[in-house]
Interface confidence: medium
């Protein structure tokens, strides 16, 4: 098919970075300013993406590849190819319609993006809370109470006595 196409279609000889210009008897012309073609044989060049506002340029547009954007400090990318920028929050917060809000008791977020997630329920695995959870950190589960009984062998050494941790109901 490719061979047939190249015999019949002069545009197939136009490399990436050019377009097949019908106004010039189908000869290859360079992509105009602010445009690109990533494959050969194209009849038009695509307009380069503009990284404006909250977007900033990560990679400049070239004659053969589109510009790539990321987000200005204080924002992070969402969607394929960083199609959106979303505001960062602090660790221990999540973004709501009303802005950044602290995580509710029993939940945490250890990143500047995403939602608050429930603390791990250690008791579901038959374990106890070794380190309490906070808004920024999940609880750390320790050995099960049975592992701490006299004579039981445990990989994890017994934890020092401490306040019992909170785990979500």
């Amino acid at each position: 098919f490719e061979r047939t196409r190249s015999l019949q279609d002069p545009c197939s000889n136009c490399p990436a970075g050019t377009f097949c210009d019908n106004n010039r008897n189908q000869i290859c012309s360079p992509c105009p300013p602010n445009s690109f073609s990533s494959a050969g044989g194209q009849r038009t060049c695509d307009i380069c993406r503009q990284c404006k506002g909250v977007f900033r340029t990560r990679k400049e547009c070239s004659s053969t590849s589109n510009a790539e954007c990321d987000c200005t400090p204080g924002f992070h990318c969402l969607g394929a190819g960083c199609s959106m920028c979303e505001q960062d929050c602090k660790q221990g917060q999540e973004l709501t319609k009303k802005g950044c809000k602290d995580c509710c008791f029993g939940t945490f977020n250890d990143q500047k993006r995403g939602i608050c997630r429930p603390w791990t329920n250690c008791s579901l695995d038959g374990k106890s809370v070794l380190v309490n959870g906070t808004k920024e950190r999940d609880v750390v589960c320790g050995p099960s109470p049975a592992d701490l009984s006299p004579g039981a062998s445990s990989v994890t050494p017994p934890a020092p006595a401490r306040e019992p941790g909170h785990s979500p109901q």
């Epitope: 490399p15 290859c28 012309s29 360079p30 300013p33 547009c61």
Partner: antibody
């Protein structure tokens, strides 16, 4: 007769900006792209960027991204090149050049050049 | 983005032929037939001598010819004349974000 007439010589201090103009005549202004090329004293030619006078779209050389702005005024058939945050290395003759028909691969007419000196 | 590579100088006697090379990569000279050559006399603006590798603008002497092989383009001046003494620059379209690149220039001296 095709002509590209550029503005006069400029002397600027480091950190300042300069705006060079290039007035076209003798052809349909919006049908031909305009390149900007510079030449430091005793050095070679350096491509800076290109503007489509019809739509105003631009492509700049990576070296000048963020410092150069090319604009046009179709009512006066004039193209402008503004370079900001000037440093001594920007001392050069700045040329505008008409892209050959239909944005071919070359520049067939050139302005006379504008000498820009950056000195404290 | 480094410039295309040209010899710093080439010389010849009147009537001789000389060739100036312009070496790039497959991303510029080798990838496209968009190579042009410019002549520049001291204190003057450049003048287009060859475009699209081998095409001559009207008004340019037939003594000037261009060609390309692989990643190297060449400008040949036959029947060298005193007025050919000048700097010559090649220029190519490129896949980089710097769309057009010049060579470093070649000083042609007529002995």
């Amino acid at each position: 007769e095709v002509q590209l007439v550029q503005s006069g010589a400029e002397v600027k201090k480091p950190g300042a900006s300069v705006k060079v103009s290039c007035k076209a005549s003798g052809y349909t202004f919006t049908s031909y792209y305009t390149h900007w090329v510079r030449q430091a004293p005793g050095q070679g030619l350096e491509w800076m960027g290109i503007i489509n006078p019809s739509g105003g779209s631009t492509s700049y050389a990576q070296k000048f991204q963020g410092r150069v702005t090319m604009t046009r005024d179709t009512s006066t058939s004039t193209v402008y090149m503004e370079l900001s945050s000037l440093r001594s290395e920007d001392t050069a003759v700045y040329y505008c050049a008409r892209g050959a028909p239909e944005y071919s691969s070359s520049s067939d007419y050139w302005g006379q050049g504008t000498m820009v000196t950056v000195s404290s | 983005q480094s410039a295309l590579t040209q010899p710093a100088s080439v010389s010849g006697s009147p009537g001789q032929s000389i060739t100036i090379s312009c070496t790039g990569t497959s991303s510029d000279v080798g990838g496209y037939n968009f190579v042009s050559w410019y002549q520049q006399h001291p204190g003057k603006a450049p003048k287009l001598m060859i475009y699209d590798v081998s095409k001559r603008p009207s008004g340019v002497s037939t003594r000037f010819s261009g060609s390309k092989s692989g990643n190297t383009a060449s400008l040949t001046i036959s029947g060298l004349q005193a007025e050919d003494e000048a700097d010559y620059y090649c220029n190519s379209y490129t896949t980089s974000s710097t769309r057009w690149m010049f060579g470093g220039g070649t000083k042609v001296t007529v002995l």
